[in-house]
Interface confidence: low
């Protein structure tokens, strides 16, 4: 593994424990200047394997809001625009950090938490099964 | 709106201020227990537009390893296992949260940080702009 | 839960200009956009402008390109929409919300809407 040295100017902390707690500036940093502004603006619309997104808000969480997509069909959008259920829409799920208010109801106080969310729909050939 | 009562037992602090820093807790907890740990794991290579993952490792970062979805090719695999490029592969992009050192090598001190990554690609009909 | 309030909408002349303001509550962070849609008389709600809360970039729908401007106050939790070159057709009540940014989708996914404002262009 890669060795860091420590920063002489890093804050105190008594925690010398892993789990540990840290302090965390939530004045968000945002690293995407070079992406295009429209990036994938429309697939959810234009795919083969469409998708709807829908709200889901915690005010315990943070960020409160994250928006989940579901697939509109269990079939795939073929060249005449019908569904195609030799094919399958199925969701692309990823593995995201969020912050959980801890104790509840801190403004302050937060723990680390991996919530599943579902991002968009790929058009997937089927698994199957054939019986001996 | 939902106005939460505050938890007398909050760690107490000074900072009036949005955007703060704030505690957290490293030790993550895990929402995902109900999930087919299957999931998603072999769509990249079923999909109609399938993808190559690209492991993005960042010892400043927490998570420090990510992995980047690439679209194996920019037309869709047909019925015949041919690339279609009368359709287009691309990537669903999603804004995540991590962790940054800051000031950088500390241990003990982040800063929210926004990233872009691609978790997969789908399979989009073309934009096709006709010439007047 | 997230509260939106909107103001700036009157009545005015075709070619003039108007500035509408979005007053947000209740939002603790939005890694994602606000967005500004219209309803027309007689049509169904439309997506207008969107801007990211973070990075601050833009997008709009074709019909206002150019015309329309969409800007964000992060401190005062505030977002704006300035509207030049005001057309007939650009009459509508103005309703502001938070959304996936780029993804004008579904309407009834949004958070609970506000009142609006209203915007009317006489010729």
């Known amino acids: 593994g890669i060795t860091i040295p420590r920063n002489p100017g890093c804050p105190n902390s008594e925690d010398k424990n892993f789990p540990r707690t840290v302090m965390v500036n939530l004045n968000i940093h945002n690293r995407n200047t070079n992406t295009n502004p429209k990036r994938s603006s429309d697939y959810y619309n234009r795919s083969t394997s469409p998708w709807n997104l829908h709200r889901n808000e915690d005010p315990e969480r943070y960020p409160s809001v994250i928006w989940e997509a579901k697939c509109r069909h269990l079939g795939c959008i073929n060249a005449d625009g019908n569904v195609d259920y030799h094919m399958n829409s199925v969701p692309i799920q990823q593995e995201i950090l969020v912050l959980r208010r801890e104790p509840p109801h801190c403004p302050n106080s937060f723990r680390l938490e991996k919530i599943l969310v579902s991002v968009g729909c790929t058009c997937v050939t089927p698994i199957v099964h054939h019986v001996a | 709106g939902i106005t939460i009562p505050r938890n007398p037992g909050c760690p107490n602090s000074e900072d009036k201020n949005f955007p703060r820093t704030v505690m957290v807790n490293l030790n993550i907890h895990n929402r995902n227990t109900n999930t087919n740990p299957k999931r998603s794991s072999d769509y990249y290579n079923r999909s109609t537009s399938p993808w190559n993952l690209h492991r993005n490792e960042d010892p400043e970062r927490y998570p420090s390893v990510i992995w980047e979805a690439k679209c194996r090719h920019l037309g869709c695999i047909n019925a015949d296992g041919n690339v279609d490029y009368h359709m287009n592969s691309v990537p669903i992009q999603q804004e995540i949260l991590v962790l940054r050192r800051e000031p950088p090598h500390c241990p003990n001190s982040f800063r929210l940080e926004k990233i872009l990554v691609s978790v997969g690609c789908t399979c989009v009909t073309p934009i096709v702009h006709h010439v007047a | 839960q997230v509260q939106l309030v909107e103001s700036g909408g009157d009545l005015v002349q075709a070619g003039g200009s108007l500035r509408l303001s979005c007053s947000v509550s209740g939002l603790r962070v939005s890694s994602y956009a606000m967005g500004w849609f219209r309803q027309a008389p007689g049509k169904e709600r439309e997506f207008v402008a969107a801007?990211?809360?973070?990075?601050?970039?833009?997008r709009y729908a074709d019909s206002v390109k150019g015309r329309f401007t969409m800007s964000r106050d992060n401190a005062k939790k505030q977002v704006y929409l300035e509207m030049n070159s005001l057309k007939p057709e650009d009459t509508a009540v103005y309703y502001c919300?938070?959304?996936?940014?780029?993804?004008?989708?579904?309407?009834?996914?949004?958070?609970?809407w506000g009142q609006g404002t209203q915007v009317t262009v006489s010729s």
């Open positions: 919300n938070d959304m996936p940014y780029g993804m004008e989708t579904r309407m009834d996914d949004y958070a609970s």
């Open positions: 801007i990211s809360w973070v990075g601050g970039d833009t």
